[in-house]
Interface confidence: medium
């Protein structure tokens, strides 16, 4: 079963990357009692959300850039 149905995780699957121009903001959720894994959730400019793989080099670069632009929390 997807992890979201076992804990209270929001990311059932993750994307390895996404084009920076499509991202409005990024949220990084640390592990906790609600979810045992780090979760990276991007809010896209079309209003949708997408989970990104925190271990992906491309995602790490996205997080760095969003932090510099003040669009990450």
């Amino acid at each position: 079963a997807p992890l979201a149905t076992e804990l209270r995780c929001q990311c059932l699957q993750t994307l390895q990357g996404i084009h920076l121009k499509n991202i409005q903001s990024v949220k990084v959720k640390s592990p906790g009692p609600h979810c045992a894994q780090t979760e990276v959730i991007a809010t896209l400019k079309n209003g949708q959300k997408a989970c990104l793989n925190p271990a992906s080099p491309m995602v790490k670069k996205i997080i760095e850039k969003m932090l510099k632009n003040g669009k990450s929390n």
Epitope: P2, E6, R8, C9, L12, G32, P33, K49, A50
Partner: antibody
């Protein structure tokens, strides 16, 4: 029609026990997390407990931890709340709620989108 | 635990008014916040999910905004059926917590 129906409430003495049930219909019960939420007379909403779809993960408010146990029987489409060592402050209407997850691309969230009608629990001598 | 604080606790308004209810979290919860409406003797009803998304079947006069720690529920052009108690709820982490509620009364 998606429906939740609670039962099992009533009057119980302090220190006593009660088991609440919530019968679900109209959706695939085993796929979704469920919660219990209570409301003391004239007060606001207080989350009590939650359980994952498989029953493998459970969560409790500090106020009930060690006294209440949430469980589910997916073969019967039923959610339970076993309440032990009841106190006067546990007096409330108890609601079960479905935590309907919405799935956008690679994203899931939890909202209590369907509620039962509530079952009253009174703890008094 | 994350504390949720709503203001005001009660509010008097007239049909046709525009009202705003605020909810503040004790720490950042991103947009992991919902709004519920409850009428006396009834179960709560989901209005807004993820801070700003209207639940299916909810009239468009309801809207939500905010992110981080500060959130707002706005009702444009109040209707008689809108007089009720409103609650915010965070699901960023367990334990899940609700605001204390805002009772909207007829002036």
């Amino acid at each position: 029609e998606v429906q939740l129906l609670e039962s099992g409430g009533g009057l119980v003495q302090p220190g006593g026990s009660l088991r609440l049930s919530c019968a679900a219909s109209g959706f695939t019960f085993s796929e979704l997390s469920m919660s219990w939420v209570r409301q003391a007379p004239g007060k606001g909403l207080e989350w009590v407990s939650a359980i994952s779809g498989s029953g493998g993960s459970t969560y409790y408010a500090d106020s009930v931890k060690g006294r209440f146990t949430i469980s589910r029987d997916n073969s019967k489409n039923t959610l339970y709340l076993q309440m032990n060592s009841l106190r006067a402050e546990d007096t409330a209407v108890y609601y079960c709620a479905r935590e309907g997850g919405r799935l956008e691309p690679y994203y899931y969230y939890y909202a209590m989108d369907v509620w039962g009608q509530g079952t009253p629990v009174t703890v008094s001598s | 635990d994350i504390q949720m604080t709503q203001s005001p606790s009660s509010l008097s308004a007239s049909v046709g008014d525009r009202v705003t209810i605020t909810c503040r979290a004790s720490q950042s919860i991103s947009d992991n916040l919902h709004w519920y409406q409850q009428k006396p003797g009834k179960a709560p009803k989901l209005l807004i999910y993820d801070a700003s998304n209207l639940e299916s079947g909810v009239p468009s006069r309801f809207s939500g905004s905010g992110s981080g720690t500060d959130f707002t529920l706005t009702i444009n052009s109040l209707q008689p059926e809108d007089f009720a108690t409103y609650y915010c709820q965070q699901y960023y982490s367990t334990p899940l917590t609700f605001g204390q509620g805002t009772k909207l009364e007829i002036k």
